[in-house]
Interface confidence: low
């Protein structure tokens, strides 16, 4: 057969659905990869062909659209289930081509399992609200094309394994769930669980995501450095090792770099010659708010090394601060050394 | 060893008002959900109420909805059941149940039951 | 709420004999089904969580099935001591459901 621009196999499209429940694929041609739309290629003459390899199997074939009840089929640039079996795990390719033009990806697709309080393999997408914000929502996602506006599905949300009802600050809203004030407790899992109904049959559409309650920007502060600060002098003496950390509270900021980094002298230790190594650690509060260590270590100091100036710099979307380390070399004790011998025992 | 023991149970009249008790022993009783099951003589298996660990939620079913009211104490290892406008219906043996690990809605330890008869 | 249909609602065996009971539930409950068996005038005993997840101290002879809305506990050969009745119970959404139950007589 003649060649085709083949995109070969699209990890980064990890689909995953639940077994059992309707799933609407799009084919990721038109997504990511090409420069027109499906409805031009269909006017252009171009046709778009389905098949797949099922999982552990190296051979391509046709998908099935002869199914009963039309379990899979095919509308536009959208592959349906009707709904999905666990055995529909596999590579699903799409191509779209006609006499003189061919083009295909292949993208995988995982049908998994949940239990009945919704755990499951599924990567969860994660929500963050802002704490004691007040009224915030989240919205059932990944729902839209499944049904038409004149459908009015049931919906129902979960906290973990159970039906939320006469919660305190939590209140389902059709396909919202609104959070009167968020408080760390309502941290977990939420999942919508949507039925509408098709051609006299019922299916649900499961969706779960994590909620987390973050820091408010109302509270956000610039960065604030613990340490160095002036109540602790870094004294050494020569040959010793030198251990400064630099430890910085970071409120939580979303989409925010938080950075911390040293400079000595003025100049980042990447860019001198002295034999420093830098090791960071970062903690994190409940509400995401960031503690970031990073500890500035010379083994043998010089007594130059001493004279040097060590600055610890942080900085964030909301703003930047500095602070230099107290150092220097450790005076030697006096010897007091008393020559007794003198003006004793002369003759 | 897991145990829970009802008590309380009773003749009441229609329209009566009832509490029963459950004890807990053997178990961390605050880490569990907990459940009252109803089974009226010779009939099914009916499921009535649960409480979350900290007593934060709860879930009745529809024919006890406003009337029944589940509690704990969990420093008293406890599970409760306030019954009012009792009516004929209501009549069963029920049973305390423990809920598998967190909100597996399954019931692994019960009780041996109390009765309770509404009738005039 | 979703309803859990058992069948059948009597079942006579023979000790020995291989034993089906089934329990459709209205809508899909995914594996959130148990099963338990009831003895007269005691407490039921849970055989079976998540489908077909054996309890602990549960003989091997009782196993559990399906997913979805079809499910079926199975004895595999019936003792003496399996006389009584069982009933499932889903635990997937909203409140928690049983079936009418299955009376399992001696033949």
């Known amino acids: 057969s003649e060649r085709c621009d083949d995109w070969g196999l699209d990890t980064m499209r990890q689909i995953q659905v639940f077994e059992d429940e309707p799933a609407r694929i799009k084919c990721p041609l038109f997504e990511h990869f090409l420069k027109f739309n499906y409805s031009t290629a269909h006017s252009a003459g171009l046709t778009l062909i389905w098949y797949w390899t099922r999982q552990d199997r190296d051979l391509e074939e046709p998908i099935n659209f002869r199914l009963p009840e039309n379990r899979i089929s095919k509308e536009k640039d959208v592959l349906w289930f009707r709904p999905t079996l666990l055995n529909d795990t596999g590579n699903y390719t799409c191509m779209l081509r006609n006499t003189t033009y061919c083009s295909k990806v292949a993208f995988p697709l995982e049908v998994v399992q949940k239990d009945s309080c919704f755990n499951s393999p599924m990567k969860l997408p994660v929500h963050k609200l802002y704490i004691e914000y007040g009224i915030q929502r989240i919205t059932c996602p990944n729902v839209d094309g499944y049904f038409p506006s004149s459908v009015k599905p049931t919906i129902t949300w979960y906290m973990g394994c159970y039906k939320i009802q006469n919660f305190n600050n939590v209140i389902p809203e059709g396909m919202n769930l609104s959070f009167l004030i968020a408080l760390i407790s309502n941290n977990g899992n939420y999942t919508c669980v949507v039925t509408y109904p098709e051609n006299g049959r019922t299916f649900h559409l499961t969706r779960t995501l994590t909620v987390k309650v973050v820091g408010s920007p109302k509270n956000a502060v610039p960065p604030v450095i613990h340490s160095p600060n002036d109540h602790v002098v870094y004294e050494k003496e020569p040959g010793e090792e030198l251990l400064i950390p630099c430890t910085v509270y970071f409120s939580f900021l979303m989409d925010s770099r938080n950075e911390v980094w040293w400079t000595i002298d003025g100049k980042k230790p990447d860019d001198i010659t002295i034999d420093v190594t830098i090791n960071e650690s970062i903690s994190h509060s409940r509400t995401e708010d960031e503690t970031r260590t990073q500890i500035l270590s010379i083994k043998k100091v010089t007594s130059e090394d001493l004279k040097r100036s060590y600055v610890c710099h942080a900085r964030s979307a909301k703003g930047e601060v500095a602070k230099a380390a107290k150092v220097k070399q450790k005076v030697p004790a006096p010897r007091y050394t008393v020559e007794l011998a003198c003006g004793f025992g002369a003759t | 060893e897991v145990q829970v023991v009802e008590s309380g149970g009773g003749l009441v009249q229609p329209g009566g008002s009832l509490r029963l008790s459950c004890a807990a022993s053997?178990?961390?009783?605050?880490?569990?959900?907990m459940s009252w099951v109803r089974q009226a003589p010779g009939k099914g298996l009916e499921w009535v109420a649960n409480?979350?660990?900290?007593?934060?939620?709860?879930h009745y079913v529809d024919s006890v909805k406003g009337r029944f009211t589940i509690s704990r104490d969990n420093a008293k290892t406890s599970l409760y059941l306030q019954m009012s406008s009792l009516r004929a219906e209501d009549t069963a043996v029920y049973y305390c149940?423990?809920?598998?690990?967190f909100g597996s809605g399954y019931f692994d330890y019960w009780g041996q039951g109390t009765l309770v008869t509404v009738s005039s | 709420d979703i309803q859990m249909t058992q069948s059948p609602s009597t079942l006579s065996a023979s000790v020995g004999d291989r034993v089906i009971i089934t329990c459709r539930a209205s809508?899909?409950?995914?594996?959130?089904l148990a099963w338990y068996q009831q003895k007269p005038g005691k407490a039921p005993k849970l055989l079976i969580y998540?489908?077909?997840n054996l309890e602990s101290g549960v003989p091997s002879r009782f196993s559990g099935s399906g997913s979805g809305t079809e499910f079926t506990l199975t004895i595999s050969s019936l003792q003496p001591d399996d006389f009584a009745a069982y009933y499932c119970?889903?635990?997937?959404?909203?409140?928690?459901?049983f079936g009418q139950g299955t009376k399992l007589e001696i033949k």
């Open positions: 149940a423990r809920e598998g690990y």
């Open positions: 119970q889903q635990y997937s959404y909203y409140s928690h459901t």
């Open positions: 809508q899909s409950i995914s594996r959130g």
């Open positions: 053997g178990f961390t009783f605050r880490s569990y959900w």
């Open positions: 998540k489908a077909s």
């Open positions: 409480i979350k660990q900290d007593g934060s939620e709860r």
